[in-house]
C-alpha cells in the first residue's frame, strides 16, 4: 500500500505557528489574519517503525517541497534540521530513522519524539520568532506540546 499522508499545520501550546526562516530552518511565532498563510503545511506520513502503546511513527515533510524534518548529531548534540530528499523516492514506508518521529497524541495534544534520539522532542521556545529545535526536556521552559489542524 502506498504511504498514507495527511496535510496539516502545527501550533505550539502557546498558539505560535511555524513558518520558514531561511531555506532550512523553521521558527515559531504568533500569527493572525492573513499572516496565517505564511505557516508551513506539513505532509505527515505514517511510516513503519517501532510502535508502543501511545506512539505512532510518522515522518514530517513540508507539503510540495522535497524537505523533511530530520534528527542528526551536530557537535555531539541531537539537532533538528530540514533535509532535502529526492522527491522520486520519498515518502516511503521504511524511512531512515533520522526522519522518523514518534507521534504521541493525548487529549488532542501532540508531542513528536525523535525515533533516532529517544526522549528528545520537537520543541519551541517561549520567546517569539525563535528556531524550532530538538529539546531534551519535557515540562520545562521549552514547549513540546502541539495541536494539529487538518488542511484539505
Amino acid at each position: 500500500a502506498p504511504v498514507r499522508s495527511l496535510h496539516c499545520t502545527l501550533r505550539d501550546a502557546q498558539l505560535k505557528s511555524l513558518v520558514m526562516s531561511g531555506p532550512y530552518e523553521l521558527k515559531a511565532l504568533h500569527l493572525q489574519g492573513q499572516d496565517l498563510e505564511q505557516q508551513v503545511v506539513f505532509s505527515m506520513s505514517f511510516v513503519q517503525g517501532e510502535e508502543s502503546n501511545d506512539k505512532i511513527p510518522v515522518a514530517l515533510g513540508l507539503k510540495a517541497k522535497n524537505l523533511y524534518l530530520s534528527c542528526v548529531l551536530k557537535d555531539d548534540k541531537p539537532t533538528l534540521q530540514l533535509e532535502s530528499v529526492d522527491p522520486k523516492n520519498y515518502p516511503k514506508k521504511k524511512m531512515e530513522k533520522r526522519f522518523v518521529f514518534n507521534k504521541i497524541e493525548i487529549n488532542n495534544k501532540l508531542e513528536f519524539e525523535s525515533a533516532q534520539f529517544p526522549n528528545w522532542y520537537i520543541s519551541t521556545s517561549q520567546a517569539e520568532s525563535m528556531p524550532v529545535f530538538l529539546g531534551g526536556t519535557r515540562g520545562g521552559q521549552d514547549i513540546t506540546d502541539f495541536t494539529m489542524q487538518f488542511v484539505s
Epitope: A1, F46, G49, V58, K103
Partner: antibody, heavy 120, light 111 residues
Framework: QVTLRESGPALVKPTQTLTLTCTFS??????????VSWIRQPPGKALEWLAL???????YYTTSLKTRLTISKDTSKNQVVLTMTNMDPVDTATYYC????????????WGQGTVVTVSS | QSVLTQPPSVSEAPRQRVTISCSGS????????VNWYQQLPGKAPKLLIY???LLSSGVSDRFSGSKSGTSASLAISGLQSEDEADYYC???????????FGGGTKLTVLG
C-alpha cells in the same frame, strides 16, 4: 491500558441482521493513525478479516462480504459497530475486534471475542 | 483458500528451533509489512512480530521474524510446551485493499 470488548447476540436466526459493538478504552479513534477492525474465526478454521474503520472515517471491507457489511464509529462513546445482513449458518464464528495502527497495519491489541451462532 | 500460504502443522522437540513459513505475492508480502500472531487454544490471537522483524512489546526474544521477497518466516528457538499454539501470518494486500491472513500453522511440541 488498551482494552477492547465485543458485545452482541450469541444466537441469531438465518436471514436476520447481526449487530456487534466493539467498546474500547485506552486510546481514541480520533487519533490520527488509529484503526479498529473486525475479524472472525469459524470453529476450527483460520482467521478472516471483515472490515476496518480509520480515524478519518475511511472504511474498508473484505470483497466477498462487502454487500452485507457496514462498519461505523462513535468516537465520543469509544465504540465501533459492525452490522452484517442476511446471516447464514456458515457465518457461525467467534467475532473479534482489534486495534490497528497505520504504519505497521498490525492488529496489536485484540478483544476476547464473542461467539455468534446462526441457527433456526 | 487463504491468500497467504502456511504449512498446516509443524512439530519439534522441546529446546529445539522451529521455523514456520508464509508465502504470498508482490501485492501483499512483497510490498507490505508482515505480521505474526500466536493463538493459544481457546484464546484470542496475540501479536508477536510486526513490520517483518520487530518484536511486539512483552514478547519473548525466542521469537523472531524475517522476510525475503514474497516469503516470510517465523522462527521459535528454545521450544517450550507453552509455545503449542496456532500461528498466523498476515499482511496488507494492495489488490484486495485490506489485510489478509495465512491459513494458520499448528505447532506441536513433542514429548
Amino acid at each position: 491500558q488498551v482494552t477492547l470488548r465485543e458485545s452482541g447476540p450469541a444466537l441469531v436466526k438465518p436471514t436476520q441482521t447481526l449487530t456487534l459493538t466493539c467498546t474500547f478504552s485506552g486510546f481514541s479513534l480520533s487519533t490520527s493513525g488509529m484503526w479498529v477492525s473486525w475479524i472472525r474465526q469459524p470453529p476450527g478454521k483460520a482467521l478472516e478479516w471483515l472490515a476496518l474503520i480509520d480515524w478519518g472515517d475511511d472504511k474498508y471491507y473484505t470483497t466477498s462480504l462487502k454487500t452485507r457489511l457496514t462498519i461505523s464509529k462513535d468516537t465520543s462513546k469509544n465504540q465501533v459497530v459492525l452490522t452484517m445482513t442476511n446471516m447464514d449458518p456458515v457465518d457461525t464464528a467467534t467475532y473479534y475486534c482489534a486495534r490497528m495502527r497505520e504504519g505497521s497495519r498490525a492488529f496489536d491489541i485484540w478483544g476476547q471475542g464473542t461467539v455468534v451462532t446462526v441457527s433456526s | 483458500q487463504s491468500v497467504l500460504t502456511q504449512p498446516p502443522s509443524v512439530s519439534e522437540a522441546p529446546r529445539q528451533r522451529v521455523t514456520i513459513s508464509c508465502s504470498g505475492s508482490s501485492s501483499n508480502i512483497g510490498d507490505n509489512a508482515v505480521n505474526w500472531y500466536q493463538q493459544l487454544p481457546g484464546k484470542a490471537p496475540k501479536l508477536l512480530i510486526y513490520n517483518d522483524d520487530l518484536l511486539s512489546s512483552g514478547v519473548s526474544d525466542r521469537f523472531s521474524g524475517s522476510k525475503s521477497g514474497t516469503s516470510a518466516s517465523l522462527a521459535i528457538s528454545g521450544l517450550q510446551s507453552e509455545d503449542e499454539a496456532d500461528y498466523y501470518c498476515a499482511a496488507w494486500d494492495d489488490s484486495l485493499n485490506g489485510p489478509v491472513f495465512g491459513g494458520g500453522t499448528k505447532l506441536t511440541v513433542l514429548g
